[in-house]
């Protein structure tokens, strides 16, 4: 064996944005025949030796941070990739319009602004299919999302959460969905 | 309430073998990870092994690696260290210590300790 | 050699605050793990003082506090007492061979 053994994989299924009190599975996968897993939480200094962590109902406390690792003999693998577990449903939702509108001809310009009664610094939009969201830390209780040149990849169904820096897993309920229309 | 007690300590020669025992009760000893930690004479602590619940999770610090086992006996609430080959430098207390748990979760921090045995190894 | 470090020694007169720091590095520390604080009384076990940067079991006075930031950590101890005397350990994890390590340890002594 020379080096380390590889990292395994860590994912939240059906997904890493999990509203409260709904199931969640995070499965560490590393190659065939490992002899130990390690799934590790991390800022808590919690553990378990299991390759799979069930959580039947989201809580607060478990948002954040997650890492997993295998053993096979006396060799510990790199660690996985971070997977960061967001509790959505903590706070009331954001509202998110789009200005001018949310029609919008393809080359022109559109920006989508996500507005929150809450005292929050941190906003995430999501497009409907796409794995990741786009952040983007704002003042004055709102963010904007400027589109600029929309072709027709930008339309689809967009939804967007509020949160604090100072707790960046505990989410907003998402925003009414909001569709973006691209015509010409 | 939770004890732990080592035993089987005392004076080995160079390359000598010892086996240490660790008597747990107040607890349910299967539920848990336990360490084996050391502090040479006037020096500080040095974790040495740490054993899973069930006995299959084992690791070693790398002074002691294929030089000492650890096991355990959940049914007599045992847990144990044998050491082989040893060394001057294996003089110390051996503590064994309990790791935090909580619901499904084990914590990388020692809640209980034992009081120690002494290992002497000098010729 | 340790892999946390920590000063050998610190002193303080009765009724003062002292401080203790343990640095880490990247792969323990900084990677995540929480630090830990035990006492060790003169011819005792350690018995655990602060878990998980900043917490108190059960029984330990709130003269005692603990801290976190990066790849260090402090303890801190306010109203210094004459039963304070010990050695101190702070205690993290390792990512790298998942191994768990201590600071060198800290000798307090209390002046007068």
């Known amino acids: 064996q020379s080096g380390p053994l590889p990292k395994p994989s860590l994912q939240a299924l059906p997904s890493s944005l999990v509203p409260l009190e709904k199931p969640v599975t995070l499965r560490c996968q590393g190659p065939p025949g490992v002899d130990l897993y390690r799934l590790e939480k991390l800022s808590s200094s919690r553990y378990q030796d299991q390759a799979v962590l069930f959580i039947p109902a989201m809580k607060r406390s478990l948002a954040g941070r997650y890492r997993c690792s295998y053993q096979n003999g006396s060799l510990w693998s790199l660690p996985s990739d971070q997977l960061e577990l967001v509790a959505t449903g903590v706070f009331a939702k954001p509202s998110l319009s789009a200005q001018p509108g949310p029609a919008v001809s393809s080359g022109g310009d559109v920006t989508l602004q996500c507005q929150t009664r809450y005292g929050f610094d941190q906003f995430a939009l999501y497009k409907e299919g796409d794995p990741a969201p786009y952040k983007n830390p704002e003042r004055w209780y709102r963010a904007s999302f400027p589109i600029i040149t929309v072709t027709a990849a930008h339309s689809g169904t967009y939804r967007c959460y509020s949160f604090s820096s100072r707790d960046p897993y505990l989410w907003s309920a998402p925003s009414d969905p909001l569709e973006l229309v691209v015509t010409g | 309430q939770v004890q732990l007690v080592e035993s089987g300590g005392g004076l080995v020669k160079p390359g000598g073998s010892l086996r240490l025992s660790c008597a747990a009760s107040?607890?349910?000893?299967?539920?848990?990870?336990v360490s084996w930690i050391r502090q040479a004479p006037g020096k500080g602590l040095e974790w040495v092994s740490a054993i899973g619940g069930s006995g299959s999770a084992v690791q070693y610090a790398e002074s002691v690696k294929g030089r000492f086992t650890i096991s355990r006996d959940n049914a007599k609430n045992s847990l144990y260290l044998q050491m082989n080959s040893l060394r001057a430098e294996d003089t110390a207390v051996y503590y064994c210590?309990?790791?935090?748990?909580?619901?499904?979760?084990?914590?990388?921090?020692?809640?209980?300790w034992g009081q120690g045995t002494l290992v002497t190894v000098s010729s | 050699q340790s892999v946390l470090t920590q000063p050998p020694s610190v002193s303080g007169a009765p009724g003062q605050r002292v401080t203790i720091s343990c640095t880490g590095s990247?792969?323990?520390?900084?990677?995540?793990?929480?630090v830990h604080w035990y006492q060790q009384l003169p011819g005792t076990a350690p018995k655990l003082l602060i878990y998980g940067n900043s917490n108190r079991p059960s029984g330990v006075p709130d003269r005692f506090s603990g801290s976190k930031s990066g790849t260090s950590a402090s303890l801190a101890i306010t109203g210094l007492q004459a039963e304070d005397e010990a050695d101190y350990y702070c205690?993290?994890?390792?990512?790298?061979?998942?191994?768990?390590?201590f600071g060198g340890g800290t000798k307090l002594t209390v002046l007068g």
């Open positions: 107040g607890f349910s000893f299967g539920d848990y990870y």
């Open positions: 990247s792969s323990n520390i900084g990677a995540g793990y929480d």
């Open positions: 205690q993290s994890h390792d990512l790298g061979a998942h191994v768990w390590v």
């Open positions: 210590a309990r790791h935090y748990r909580e619901f499904r979760w084990h914590y990388y921090y020692f809640d209980y």
